[in-house]
């Protein structure tokens, strides 16, 4: 079963290899260090 | 002003652990990631992992999977890295990050 | 783990003439969505790093337009135009395709 967050990276559990494809959708701040949104 | 706030400088024995903290002010924690990374010396950067602040959902960086944990605590508006069983390779500046923010940096010392 | 490669030292070079640092990733960062998933960070003197480039061409918040970055899926290069005192650091270069990786920097040396 993939996993999805909003990381573009991969993980290792369970040996197993689980893609985080990024979430374009989303403002989370998946981007070290990238202004998202305003002040909240 | 907005900005992340980071806990002093810490001196540790080797084989104790360690809790940095990490509060935003002017700025709500909960709403994005905050990333942790490592600075061994000046150049040299290691992500350790992330926290979503909303759910606790975490991902590490496997080298530190047994060496960090990564907390939030909402109603004080600050994060927390917590590192385990200390080394002498434990020793860096320790950086917290949301969204555009970057806390000034926490050096930890590891030393008996 | 992918391997993002970086030489210590630039060359060095004078104030307002244009100066050039690359990175190497030992996998391609190019996405099958078409997103390049590279990075490029300053750290100045005393100063927690800051995003300049993200995904490989976009220019973060408040970087000067002098910035621009270029490249494959393998080799990168940020150019600064018309070099300025405050520019002087350590550049990294960083990817996330999988996860979080850095290059070791690249300090920019002033004649």
């Known amino acids: 079963d993939a996993e999805f967050g909003h990381d573009s990276g991969f993980e290792v559990r369970h040996q197993k290899l689980v893609f985080f494809a990024e979430d374009v959708g989303s403002n989370k701040g998946a981007i070290i260090g990238l202004m998202v949104g305003g002040v909240v | 002003e907005v900005q992340l706030q980071q806990s002093g400088a810490e001196l540790v024995e080797p084989g104790a652990s360690v809790k940095l903290s990490c509060t935003g002010s002017?700025?709500?924690?909960?709403?994005?990631?905050v990333h942790w990374l490592k600075q061994l010396t000046e150049q040299g950067l290691e992500w350790i992992g992330r926290?979503?602040?909303?759910?606790?959902?975490?991902i590490y960086t496997p080298k530190f999977q047994d060496k960090a944990t990564l907390t939030v605590d909402t109603s004080s508006n600050t994060a927390y890295l917590q590192l385990s069983s200390l080394t002498s390779e434990d020793a860096a500046v320790y950086y917290c990050?949301?969204?555009?923010?970057w806390g000034q940096g926490t050096t930890l010392t590891v030393s008996s | 783990d992918i391997v993002m490669t970086q030489s210590a030292f630039s060359n060095p070079v004078t104030l307002g003439t244009s100066a050039s640092i690359s990175c190497r990733s030992s996998k391609s960062l190019l996405h099958r969505n078409g997103i390049t998933y590279l990075y490029w960070y300053l750290q100045k003197p005393g100063q927690p790093p800051q995003l300049l480039i993200y995904?490989?061409?976009n220019l973060a918040s408040g970087v000067p337009d002098r910035f621009t970055s270029s490249g494959s899926g393998t080799d990168f290069t940020l150019k600064i135009s018309r070099v300025e005192a405050e520019d002087v650091g350590v550049y990294y270069c960083a990817q996330n395709l999988e996860l979080w990786t850095f290059g070791g920097g690249t300090k920019l040396e002033i004649k």
């Open positions: 990050v949301s969204s555009g923010y």
């Open positions: 995904q490989m061409s």
């Open positions: 926290i979503d602040p909303e759910n606790g959902e975490t």
């Open positions: 002017g700025f709500n924690i909960k709403v994005y990631y």
